[in-house]
Protein backbone atom coordinates (compact mmCIF):
# COMPACT_ATOMS: atom_id res chain seq x y z
CA UNK A 1 0.00 0.00 0.00
CA UNK A 2 2.12 3.22 -1.30
CA UNK A 3 -0.25 5.13 1.37
CA UNK A 4 1.29 3.32 4.14
CA UNK A 5 4.74 3.39 2.86
CA UNK A 6 4.49 7.08 2.97
CA UNK A 7 3.38 7.08 6.35
CA UNK A 8 5.68 4.61 7.74
CA UNK A 9 8.74 7.34 5.92
CA UNK A 10 7.26 9.91 7.51
CA UNK A 11 7.11 7.91 10.85
CA UNK A 12 11.12 6.61 10.48
CA UNK A 13 11.93 10.70 9.69
CA UNK A 14 9.98 11.80 13.40
CA UNK A 15 11.77 8.98 14.71
CA UNK A 16 14.92 9.86 13.20
CA UNK A 17 14.46 13.41 14.31
CA UNK A 18 12.68 13.63 17.67
CA UNK A 19 13.41 10.43 19.76
CA UNK A 20 16.82 9.17 21.28
CA UNK A 21 19.00 6.09 20.27
CA UNK A 22 17.86 4.99 24.20
CA UNK A 23 14.34 5.76 23.68
CA UNK A 24 14.05 4.26 20.64
CA UNK A 25 15.58 0.95 22.43
CA UNK A 26 12.98 1.24 25.32
CA UNK A 27 10.46 1.04 22.76
CA UNK A 28 11.32 -1.80 20.75
CA UNK A 29 13.06 -3.95 23.93
CA UNK A 30 9.99 -3.52 26.22
CA UNK A 31 6.98 -5.16 25.14
CA UNK A 32 4.80 -2.93 27.29
CA UNK A 33 6.10 0.01 25.82
CA UNK A 34 5.38 -0.89 22.20
CA UNK A 35 1.97 -2.08 22.81
CA UNK A 36 1.62 0.86 24.77
CA UNK A 37 2.99 2.95 21.77
CA UNK A 38 1.01 1.13 19.37
CA UNK A 39 -2.43 1.48 21.05
CA UNK A 40 -1.67 5.89 21.18
CA UNK A 41 -0.80 5.53 17.64
CA UNK A 42 -3.61 3.88 16.61
CA UNK A 43 -2.02 1.90 14.78
CA UNK A 44 -3.75 -1.39 12.19
CA UNK A 45 -1.91 -4.52 12.98
CA UNK A 46 0.14 -4.37 9.78
CA UNK A 47 1.50 -0.82 9.71
CA UNK A 48 2.34 -1.72 13.31
CA UNK A 49 4.61 -4.70 11.86
CA UNK A 50 5.28 -2.70 9.10
CA UNK A 51 6.99 0.06 11.42
CA UNK A 52 8.13 -2.49 13.68
CA UNK A 53 10.71 -3.94 10.82
CA UNK A 54 11.50 -0.28 9.56
CA UNK A 55 12.38 1.11 13.28
CA UNK A 56 14.44 -2.45 14.19
CA UNK A 57 16.45 -1.27 10.84
CA UNK A 58 16.90 2.36 12.13
CA UNK A 59 17.94 1.43 15.82
CA UNK A 60 20.74 -0.72 14.11
CA UNK A 61 21.65 2.57 12.11
CA UNK A 62 21.58 4.66 15.05
CA UNK A 63 23.59 2.32 17.15
CA UNK A 64 26.24 1.72 14.47
CA UNK A 65 26.57 5.93 13.65
CA UNK A 66 26.63 6.72 17.24
CA UNK A 67 28.63 3.75 18.83
CA UNK A 68 29.63 5.49 22.23
CA UNK A 69 25.64 6.54 22.77
CA UNK A 70 25.56 4.67 26.03
CA UNK A 71 28.70 5.97 27.36
CA UNK A 72 27.84 9.40 26.43
CA UNK A 73 24.31 9.11 27.74
CA UNK A 74 26.40 8.01 31.15
CA UNK A 75 28.32 10.75 31.28
CA UNK A 76 25.75 13.22 31.24
CA UNK A 77 23.90 11.35 33.84
CA UNK A 78 26.03 11.66 36.11
CA UNK A 79 26.70 15.14 35.10
CA UNK A 80 23.09 15.92 36.01
CA UNK A 81 23.33 14.40 39.08
CA UNK A 82 26.62 15.56 40.24
CA UNK A 83 24.83 19.09 39.04
CA UNK A 84 21.10 18.44 40.14
CA UNK A 85 20.51 19.51 43.65
CA UNK A 86 22.52 23.21 43.11
CA UNK A 87 20.53 23.68 40.42
CA UNK A 88 17.35 23.18 41.85
CA UNK A 89 18.40 25.40 44.80
CA UNK A 90 18.91 28.22 42.08
CA UNK A 91 15.52 27.45 40.32
CA UNK A 92 13.56 27.15 43.83
CA UNK A 93 15.29 30.93 44.39
CA UNK A 94 14.14 32.33 40.65
CA UNK A 95 10.56 30.93 42.05
CA UNK A 96 10.25 32.56 44.98
CA UNK A 97 11.55 35.82 43.37
CA UNK A 98 8.96 35.50 40.64
CA UNK A 99 6.53 35.13 42.94
CA UNK A 100 7.13 38.26 45.22
CA UNK A 101 7.77 40.16 42.15
CA UNK A 102 3.91 39.32 41.36
CA UNK A 103 3.00 39.81 44.69
CA UNK A 104 4.55 43.58 44.68
CA UNK A 105 6.66 43.12 47.95
CA UNK A 106 8.81 46.16 48.16
CA UNK A 107 12.95 44.77 48.03
CA UNK A 108 15.17 46.27 50.96
CA UNK A 109 17.46 48.41 48.80
CA UNK A 110 15.48 51.60 47.79
CA UNK A 111 16.02 52.64 44.40
CA UNK A 112 15.74 48.88 43.12
CA UNK A 113 14.69 48.27 39.54
CA UNK A 114 12.40 45.11 38.93
CA UNK A 115 14.99 44.30 36.44
CA UNK A 116 17.65 44.07 38.80
CA UNK A 117 15.75 41.95 41.56
CA UNK A 118 15.54 39.54 39.29
CA UNK A 119 19.03 39.76 37.71
CA UNK A 120 21.57 37.44 39.50
CA UNK A 121 18.30 34.97 40.40
CA UNK A 122 18.78 33.50 36.46
CA UNK A 123 22.49 33.74 36.86
CA UNK A 124 25.00 32.60 34.01
CA UNK A 125 26.55 29.98 35.85
CA UNK A 126 27.23 26.15 34.91
CA UNK A 127 23.23 25.64 35.47
CA UNK A 128 22.64 27.91 32.03
CA UNK A 129 23.58 24.34 30.40
CA UNK A 130 20.87 22.71 32.24
CA UNK A 131 18.20 25.52 31.90
CA UNK A 132 18.60 25.14 27.73
CA UNK A 133 18.48 21.64 28.56
CA UNK A 134 14.91 22.23 29.97
CA UNK A 135 14.03 24.64 27.34
CA UNK A 136 14.38 27.90 29.06
CA UNK A 137 17.73 30.29 28.82
CA UNK A 138 18.46 32.88 31.23
CA UNK A 139 19.87 36.01 30.68
CA UNK A 140 20.66 38.69 33.05
CA UNK A 141 22.52 41.26 30.42
CA UNK A 142 21.88 44.44 31.32
CA UNK A 143 20.45 43.86 34.38
CA UNK A 144 17.28 42.57 32.99
CA UNK A 145 16.10 38.86 32.54
CA UNK A 146 15.28 37.34 29.12
CA UNK A 147 14.00 33.77 28.78
CA UNK A 148 14.65 32.19 25.80
CA UNK A 149 12.88 29.20 24.47
CA UNK A 150 15.25 26.85 22.32
CA UNK A 151 14.95 27.14 18.65
CA UNK A 152 14.17 30.65 18.93
CA UNK A 153 16.85 32.29 17.33
CA UNK A 154 15.28 32.61 14.04
CA UNK A 155 11.45 33.96 14.81
CA UNK A 156 12.56 36.45 17.57
CA UNK A 157 15.31 38.51 15.85
CA UNK A 158 12.12 39.20 12.98
CA UNK A 159 9.88 40.41 16.18
CA UNK A 160 12.52 42.69 17.57
CA UNK A 161 11.35 45.51 15.91
CA UNK A 162 8.27 45.54 17.26
CA UNK A 163 9.40 45.07 21.81
CA UNK A 164 10.16 47.50 23.69
CA UNK A 165 11.46 46.12 26.73
CA UNK A 166 11.14 49.17 29.21
CA UNK A 167 10.93 46.58 32.46
CA UNK A 168 8.94 47.69 34.86
CA UNK A 169 9.40 51.67 36.55
CA UNK A 170 10.38 50.59 40.28
CA UNK A 171 13.11 52.97 41.15
CA UNK A 172 12.69 55.75 37.84
CA UNK A 173 15.30 53.38 35.89
CA UNK A 174 13.75 53.45 32.06
CA UNK A 175 14.86 50.76 29.36
CA UNK A 176 14.89 52.15 26.05
CA UNK A 177 13.90 50.51 22.74
CA UNK A 178 16.96 50.85 21.84
CA UNK A 179 18.56 48.93 24.79
CA UNK A 180 15.90 46.34 24.86
CA UNK A 181 16.80 45.78 20.94
CA UNK A 182 20.83 45.01 22.12
CA UNK A 183 19.64 43.16 25.52
CA UNK A 184 17.88 40.62 23.05
CA UNK A 185 20.55 40.40 20.72
CA UNK A 186 23.45 39.53 23.06
CA UNK A 187 21.31 36.98 24.75
CA UNK A 188 20.44 35.37 21.53
CA UNK A 189 24.12 35.04 20.80
CA UNK A 190 24.85 33.59 24.11
CA UNK A 191 22.41 31.10 23.57
CA UNK A 192 23.45 30.09 20.32
CA UNK A 193 26.95 30.09 21.94
CA UNK A 194 25.67 27.88 24.66
CA UNK A 195 23.89 25.68 22.16
CA UNK A 196 26.93 25.48 19.76
CA UNK A 197 28.89 24.58 23.00
CA UNK A 198 26.16 21.36 23.55
CA UNK A 199 26.08 20.43 20.26
CA UNK A 200 24.90 17.15 19.53
CA UNK A 201 26.03 15.88 23.33
CA UNK A 202 22.53 17.31 24.57
CA UNK A 203 20.79 14.13 23.07
CA UNK A 204 22.21 11.90 24.91
CA UNK A 205 21.95 13.75 28.50
CA UNK A 206 18.32 14.40 27.53
CA UNK A 207 17.53 10.97 26.99
CA UNK A 208 16.39 9.95 30.50
CA UNK A 209 13.56 7.33 29.84
CA UNK A 210 11.58 8.60 32.98
CA UNK A 211 8.00 7.41 32.74
CA UNK A 212 7.78 4.66 30.01
CA UNK A 213 4.25 5.07 30.18
CA UNK A 214 4.22 8.75 29.26
CA UNK A 215 6.90 8.24 26.83
CA UNK A 216 5.32 5.70 24.83
CA UNK A 217 2.19 7.16 25.04
CA UNK A 218 3.57 10.74 23.84
CA UNK A 219 5.07 9.31 20.78
CA UNK A 220 2.41 7.31 20.30
CA UNK A 221 -0.27 10.47 20.06
CA UNK A 222 2.24 12.29 17.81
CA UNK A 223 2.29 9.50 15.07
CA UNK A 224 -1.31 9.01 15.45
CA UNK A 225 -1.56 12.74 14.77
CA UNK A 226 0.95 12.18 11.93
CA UNK A 227 -0.63 9.50 10.30
CA UNK A 228 -4.32 11.31 10.63
CA UNK A 229 -2.36 14.37 8.74
CA UNK A 230 -1.59 12.17 6.31
CA UNK A 231 -4.70 10.78 5.92
CA UNK A 232 -6.24 14.07 5.59
CA UNK A 233 -3.25 15.21 2.70
CA UNK A 234 -4.60 12.34 0.67
CA UNK A 235 -8.12 13.07 1.08
CA UNK A 236 -7.96 16.36 0.09
CA UNK A 237 -9.17 16.96 -3.73
CA UNK A 238 -6.48 18.06 -6.33
CA UNK A 239 -3.65 17.43 -3.67
CA UNK A 240 -0.16 18.05 -5.45
CA UNK A 241 0.80 14.73 -7.34
CA UNK A 242 4.49 15.33 -5.62
CA UNK A 243 4.34 14.64 -1.62
CA UNK A 244 4.69 17.44 0.76
CA UNK A 245 7.06 17.69 3.54
CA UNK A 246 5.33 17.40 6.81
CA UNK A 247 7.50 18.29 9.95
CA UNK A 248 5.69 19.07 12.77
CA UNK A 249 2.45 17.01 13.43
CA UNK A 250 0.89 18.84 15.61
CA UNK A 251 -0.72 16.76 18.50
CA UNK A 252 -4.59 17.30 19.40
CA UNK A 253 -7.70 15.49 20.93
CA UNK A 254 -9.80 16.52 18.09
CA UNK A 255 -9.44 15.38 14.46
CA UNK A 256 -8.54 19.35 13.29
CA UNK A 257 -4.98 18.53 12.41
CA UNK A 258 -3.20 22.05 11.23
CA UNK A 259 -0.16 20.72 9.54
CA UNK A 260 2.85 22.79 8.77
CA UNK A 261 4.11 21.88 5.32
CA UNK A 262 7.36 22.34 3.92
CA UNK A 263 8.14 24.96 6.67
CA UNK A 264 11.99 24.48 8.43
CA UNK A 265 10.93 22.32 11.76
CA UNK A 266 12.24 23.30 15.02
CA UNK A 267 14.67 21.29 14.58
CA UNK A 268 16.65 22.70 11.76
CA UNK A 269 16.33 25.88 13.01
CA UNK A 270 18.05 24.57 16.26
CA UNK A 271 21.51 24.36 14.48
CA UNK A 272 21.86 20.78 15.13
CA UNK A 273 20.88 20.41 18.78
CA UNK A 274 19.00 17.08 18.59
CA UNK A 275 15.36 17.39 19.99
CA UNK A 276 15.01 14.13 22.13
CA UNK A 277 12.28 12.06 23.85
CA UNK A 278 8.62 13.50 22.80
CA UNK A 279 6.90 16.42 24.47
CA UNK A 280 5.30 14.97 27.79
CA UNK A 281 8.88 13.78 28.99
CA UNK A 282 11.39 15.86 27.54
CA UNK A 283 13.16 18.66 28.76
CA UNK A 284 12.77 20.54 25.51
CA UNK A 285 8.90 21.16 26.16
CA UNK A 286 8.62 23.79 23.56
CA UNK A 287 6.82 26.24 25.05
CA UNK A 288 5.30 29.36 23.09
CA UNK A 289 7.87 32.28 23.87
CA UNK A 290 8.86 32.60 27.55
CA UNK A 291 10.86 35.86 27.43
CA UNK A 292 9.90 38.57 30.02
CA UNK A 293 9.54 42.00 28.07
CA UNK A 294 7.49 44.50 29.09
CA UNK A 295 6.10 47.62 27.92
CA UNK A 296 6.98 50.14 30.21
CA UNK A 297 4.38 48.97 32.37
CA UNK A 298 4.55 50.56 35.84
CA UNK A 299 3.93 48.85 39.28
CA UNK A 300 0.90 51.22 40.11
CA UNK A 301 -2.84 49.95 39.92
CA UNK A 302 -2.89 50.54 36.00
CA UNK A 303 -0.63 46.95 34.87
CA UNK A 304 -0.36 46.12 38.56
CA UNK A 305 -2.68 42.68 37.83
CA UNK A 306 -1.43 42.17 34.06
CA UNK A 307 2.69 42.08 35.21
CA UNK A 308 1.43 40.10 38.32
CA UNK A 309 -0.16 37.46 35.87
CA UNK A 310 3.10 37.93 33.77
CA UNK A 311 5.18 37.14 36.27
CA UNK A 312 2.88 34.01 38.07
CA UNK A 313 3.26 32.28 34.46
CA UNK A 314 6.86 32.36 34.37
CA UNK A 315 7.53 31.15 38.04
CA UNK A 316 4.38 28.44 36.78
CA UNK A 317 6.62 27.72 34.01
CA UNK A 318 9.41 26.80 35.76
CA UNK A 319 8.07 25.14 38.19
CA UNK A 320 6.39 22.77 36.01
CA UNK A 321 10.34 22.37 34.17
CA UNK A 322 11.92 21.81 38.28
CA UNK A 323 9.19 19.04 38.27
CA UNK A 324 10.37 17.30 35.40
CA UNK A 325 13.97 17.62 36.58
CA UNK A 326 13.08 16.33 39.85
CA UNK A 327 11.52 13.45 38.52
CA UNK A 328 14.36 12.99 36.52
CA UNK A 329 16.85 13.05 39.08
CA UNK A 330 14.99 10.73 41.30
CA UNK A 331 14.63 7.72 38.58
CA UNK A 332 18.22 8.06 37.51
CA UNK A 333 19.34 7.76 41.62
CA UNK A 334 16.97 5.06 41.63
CA UNK A 335 18.67 3.60 38.79
CA UNK A 336 22.41 4.06 40.21
CA UNK A 337 21.24 2.37 43.43
CA UNK A 338 20.14 -0.90 41.89
CA UNK B 1 15.95 51.31 67.27
CA UNK B 2 13.22 49.96 64.98
CA UNK B 3 9.71 50.06 66.93
CA UNK B 4 6.13 49.69 66.01
CA UNK B 5 3.97 51.31 67.99
CA UNK B 6 -0.02 50.32 67.65
CA UNK B 7 -3.13 52.69 69.09
CA UNK B 8 -4.05 51.38 72.79
CA UNK B 9 -7.00 49.09 73.17
CA UNK B 10 -10.78 49.64 71.69
CA UNK B 11 -14.66 48.73 72.80
CA UNK B 12 -16.75 49.06 70.19
CA UNK B 13 -20.65 48.00 69.27
CA UNK B 14 -21.60 45.95 66.33
CA UNK B 15 -22.08 48.07 63.12
CA UNK B 16 -19.24 50.69 64.46
CA UNK B 17 -16.13 51.28 62.42
CA UNK B 18 -12.46 51.17 64.05
CA UNK B 19 -9.30 52.34 62.79
CA UNK B 20 -6.30 50.79 64.46
CA UNK B 21 -3.01 53.13 64.30
CA UNK B 22 1.08 51.61 63.88
CA UNK B 23 3.44 54.12 64.13
CA UNK B 24 6.68 53.31 62.98
CA UNK B 25 10.44 54.57 63.87
CA UNK B 26 14.06 53.80 63.59
CA UNK B 27 13.93 52.19 60.04
CA UNK B 28 13.16 54.09 56.65
CA UNK B 29 9.05 53.85 56.18
CA UNK B 30 8.72 53.40 52.74
CA UNK B 31 11.77 50.15 52.00
CA UNK B 32 9.52 47.57 54.03
CA UNK B 33 5.78 46.66 53.20
CA UNK B 34 3.58 46.58 56.48
CA UNK B 35 0.96 43.63 57.18
CA UNK B 36 -1.66 42.97 59.77
CA UNK B 37 -2.54 39.82 61.54
CA UNK B 38 -5.69 38.88 64.07
CA UNK B 39 -5.22 36.61 66.65
CA UNK B 40 -8.66 35.65 68.15
CA UNK B 41 -9.10 34.98 71.60
CA UNK B 42 -7.87 30.82 71.65
CA UNK B 43 -7.03 30.59 68.31
CA UNK B 44 -4.02 30.63 65.82
CA UNK B 45 -2.79 33.79 63.32
CA UNK B 46 -4.35 34.32 61.01
CA UNK B 47 -2.50 36.75 58.09
CA UNK B 48 -5.22 39.92 57.00
CA UNK B 49 -3.31 41.68 53.97
CA UNK B 50 -0.49 43.98 53.52
CA UNK B 51 0.33 47.42 52.07
CA UNK B 52 3.02 48.26 49.92
CA UNK B 53 4.51 51.62 51.77
CA UNK B 54 6.04 52.55 48.30
CA UNK B 55 3.10 52.02 46.02
CA UNK B 56 0.07 51.90 47.97
CA UNK B 57 -0.47 48.68 46.68
CA UNK B 58 -2.68 46.34 48.88
CA UNK B 59 -3.33 42.80 49.09
CA UNK B 60 -5.60 41.42 51.88
CA UNK B 61 -6.45 37.46 51.98
CA UNK B 62 -9.96 36.11 51.04
CA UNK B 63 -11.63 36.55 54.22
CA UNK B 64 -10.69 39.63 54.71
CA UNK B 65 -12.02 41.66 51.87
CA UNK B 66 -14.23 43.97 51.98
CA UNK B 67 -14.84 45.24 55.18
CA UNK B 68 -11.29 45.90 56.14
CA UNK B 69 -8.90 48.01 54.73
CA UNK B 70 -5.20 48.69 55.06
CA UNK B 71 -4.30 52.40 54.41
CA UNK B 72 -1.09 54.89 54.70
CA UNK B 73 0.54 58.36 56.35
CA UNK B 74 3.45 58.19 54.63
CA UNK B 75 4.63 61.37 56.17
CA UNK B 76 3.94 59.93 59.80
CA UNK B 77 5.37 56.85 59.09
CA UNK B 78 2.27 55.58 60.20
CA UNK B 79 -0.08 52.16 58.36
CA UNK B 80 -3.66 51.94 59.51
CA UNK B 81 -6.14 49.26 59.50
CA UNK B 82 -10.03 49.81 59.66
CA UNK B 83 -12.74 48.01 60.10
CA UNK B 84 -15.68 49.10 59.28
CA UNK B 85 -19.81 47.60 60.27
CA UNK B 86 -18.10 45.52 62.89
CA UNK B 87 -19.08 42.16 63.88
CA UNK B 88 -18.84 40.21 67.42
CA UNK B 89 -16.35 37.81 65.24
CA UNK B 90 -13.80 40.66 64.92
CA UNK B 91 -12.92 40.96 68.67
CA UNK B 92 -9.54 39.79 68.57
CA UNK B 93 -5.97 41.13 69.15
CA UNK B 94 -4.51 42.86 65.87
CA UNK B 95 -0.95 43.37 65.27
CA UNK B 96 1.00 45.05 62.44
CA UNK B 97 4.17 43.80 61.49
CA UNK B 98 7.08 44.77 59.31
CA UNK B 99 7.31 42.85 55.94
CA UNK B 100 11.18 42.74 54.84
CA UNK B 101 12.07 40.90 51.46
CA UNK B 102 16.08 40.74 51.40
CA UNK B 103 15.80 39.29 47.46
CA UNK B 104 15.52 35.76 48.71
CA UNK B 105 13.34 35.97 51.57
CA UNK B 106 10.36 37.26 52.73
CA UNK B 107 9.06 37.32 56.64
CA UNK B 108 7.85 40.15 59.37
CA UNK B 109 11.01 40.68 61.51
CA UNK B 110 9.63 43.51 63.57
CA UNK B 111 6.13 43.23 65.67
CA UNK B 112 3.71 45.74 66.98
CA UNK B 113 2.89 45.31 70.58
CA UNK B 114 -1.03 44.77 69.31
CA UNK B 115 -4.25 46.17 69.77
CA UNK B 116 -6.97 44.19 71.11
CA UNK B 117 -9.94 45.40 70.07
CA UNK B 118 -13.63 44.44 71.30
CA UNK B 119 -17.04 44.50 69.72
CA UNK B 120 -19.99 44.15 72.05
CA UNK B 121 -23.09 45.17 72.19
CA UNK C 1 -4.69 29.24 48.91
CA UNK C 2 -1.57 27.53 50.46
CA UNK C 3 -2.84 25.41 53.56
CA UNK C 4 -0.14 24.71 56.44
CA UNK C 5 -1.04 22.34 58.63
CA UNK C 6 1.15 21.71 61.63
CA UNK C 7 1.71 19.13 64.21
CA UNK C 8 1.29 18.27 66.92
CA UNK C 9 -1.15 20.90 68.31
CA UNK C 10 0.22 21.01 71.84
CA UNK C 11 3.34 19.29 73.27
CA UNK C 12 4.96 19.09 76.90
CA UNK C 13 8.62 18.04 77.18
CA UNK C 14 11.08 18.33 80.31
CA UNK C 15 14.01 20.98 80.58
CA UNK C 16 16.89 19.51 78.70
CA UNK C 17 15.05 17.70 75.81
CA UNK C 18 14.78 18.22 71.99
CA UNK C 19 11.64 18.49 70.62
CA UNK C 20 10.87 18.74 66.69
CA UNK C 21 7.50 20.19 65.59
CA UNK C 22 6.32 20.06 62.11
CA UNK C 23 4.68 21.27 59.50
CA UNK C 24 3.50 20.32 55.92
CA UNK C 25 2.26 22.82 53.10
CA UNK C 26 -0.34 21.88 50.47
CA UNK C 27 2.05 22.88 47.64
CA UNK C 28 5.61 23.37 47.19
CA UNK C 29 6.96 26.65 48.71
CA UNK C 30 10.59 25.71 47.63
CA UNK C 31 11.60 26.67 51.05
CA UNK C 32 9.48 30.10 51.80
CA UNK C 33 8.54 29.41 55.27
CA UNK C 34 9.23 31.29 58.54
CA UNK C 35 8.83 29.90 62.41
CA UNK C 36 7.48 32.59 64.62
CA UNK C 37 7.30 32.43 68.51
CA UNK C 38 4.51 33.84 70.44
CA UNK C 39 5.01 33.81 74.41
CA UNK C 40 2.28 34.37 76.80
CA UNK C 41 1.34 38.20 76.48
CA UNK C 42 3.54 39.53 73.78
CA UNK C 43 3.74 39.98 70.00
CA UNK C 44 4.88 37.14 68.14
CA UNK C 45 8.96 37.21 67.24
CA UNK C 46 10.71 35.82 63.83
CA UNK C 47 12.78 32.67 64.83
CA UNK C 48 13.52 31.03 61.33
CA UNK C 49 13.49 32.78 58.24
CA UNK C 50 13.60 31.24 54.61
CA UNK C 51 13.42 27.46 56.46
CA UNK C 52 16.52 27.47 57.69
CA UNK C 53 17.83 30.55 58.84
CA UNK C 54 17.94 31.64 62.21
CA UNK C 55 16.88 35.30 63.03
CA UNK C 56 19.07 37.71 64.74
CA UNK C 57 18.94 37.92 68.09
CA UNK C 58 17.51 33.90 68.30
CA UNK C 59 18.88 31.47 70.37
CA UNK C 60 21.21 28.43 68.25
CA UNK C 61 19.43 25.85 70.13
CA UNK C 62 16.73 26.68 67.42
CA UNK C 63 16.79 25.11 64.05
CA UNK C 64 14.94 24.74 60.93
CA UNK C 65 15.07 21.69 57.71
CA UNK C 66 13.12 20.57 54.98
CA UNK C 67 12.56 17.43 53.37
CA UNK C 68 10.10 18.68 50.35
CA UNK C 69 6.96 19.89 51.46
CA UNK C 70 7.51 18.98 54.84
CA UNK C 71 9.44 21.31 56.86
CA UNK C 72 10.40 20.60 61.04
CA UNK C 73 11.65 23.41 63.99
CA UNK C 74 13.57 21.93 66.02
CA UNK C 75 14.49 22.89 69.85
CA UNK C 76 17.48 21.64 71.52
CA UNK C 77 18.54 21.90 75.22
CA UNK C 78 14.84 23.27 76.07
CA UNK C 79 14.79 25.76 78.53
CA UNK C 80 11.72 27.01 80.56
CA UNK C 81 11.79 30.21 78.60
CA UNK C 82 10.79 27.74 75.36
CA UNK C 83 7.77 27.76 76.65
CA UNK C 84 5.23 29.39 73.79
CA UNK C 85 3.11 28.46 70.96
CA UNK C 86 5.01 28.06 67.74
CA UNK C 87 3.77 29.03 64.11
CA UNK C 88 4.96 28.20 60.61
CA UNK C 89 3.92 30.21 57.67
CA UNK C 90 4.21 30.51 54.07
CA UNK C 91 5.90 33.20 52.92
CA UNK C 92 5.78 32.19 48.91
CA UNK C 93 3.19 33.66 47.88
CA UNK C 94 -0.11 35.84 49.44
CA UNK C 95 -1.78 35.54 51.24
CA UNK C 96 1.04 34.42 53.43
CA UNK C 97 -0.97 31.94 55.73
CA UNK C 98 0.01 30.58 59.36
CA UNK C 99 -0.13 26.84 60.61
CA UNK C 100 -2.66 26.07 63.06
CA UNK C 101 0.38 27.05 66.17
CA UNK C 102 1.86 24.46 68.47
CA UNK C 103 1.60 24.88 72.19
CA UNK C 104 5.44 23.96 74.23
CA UNK C 105 4.58 23.03 77.46
CA UNK C 106 7.50 22.39 80.20
CA UNK C 107 6.80 18.95 82.29
Known amino acids: DPESSIFIEDAIKYFKEKVSTQNLLLLLTDNEAWNGFVAAAELPRNEADELRKALDNLARQMIMKDKNWHDKGQQYRNWFLKEFPRLKSELEDNIRRLRALADGVQKVHKGTTIANVVSGSLSISSGILTLVGMGLAPFTEGGSLVLLEPGMELGITAALTGITSSTMDYGKKWWTQAQAHDLVIKSLDKLKEVREFLGENISNFLSLAGNTYQLTRGIGKDIRALRRARANLQSVPHASASRPRVTEPISAESGEQVERVNEPSILEMSRGVKLTDVAPVSFFLVLDVVYLVYESKHLHEGAKSETAEELKKVAQELEEKLNILNNNYKILQADQEL | QIQLVQSGPDLKKPGETVKISCRTSGYAFTNYGVNWVKQAPGKGLKWMGWINTNTGQTTYAEEFRGRFAISLETSASTAFLTISNLKNEDSATYFC??????????????WGQGTTLTVSS | DIQMTQSPDSLSASVGETVTITCGAS??????LNWYQRKQGKSPQLLIY???NLADGMSSRFSGSRSGRQYSLKISSLHPDDVATYYCQNALSMPYTFGGGTKLEIK
Open chain 2, 97 to 110: ARLIYDGDYISSDF
Open chain 3, 50 to 52: GAT
Open chain 3, 27 to 32: ENIYGA
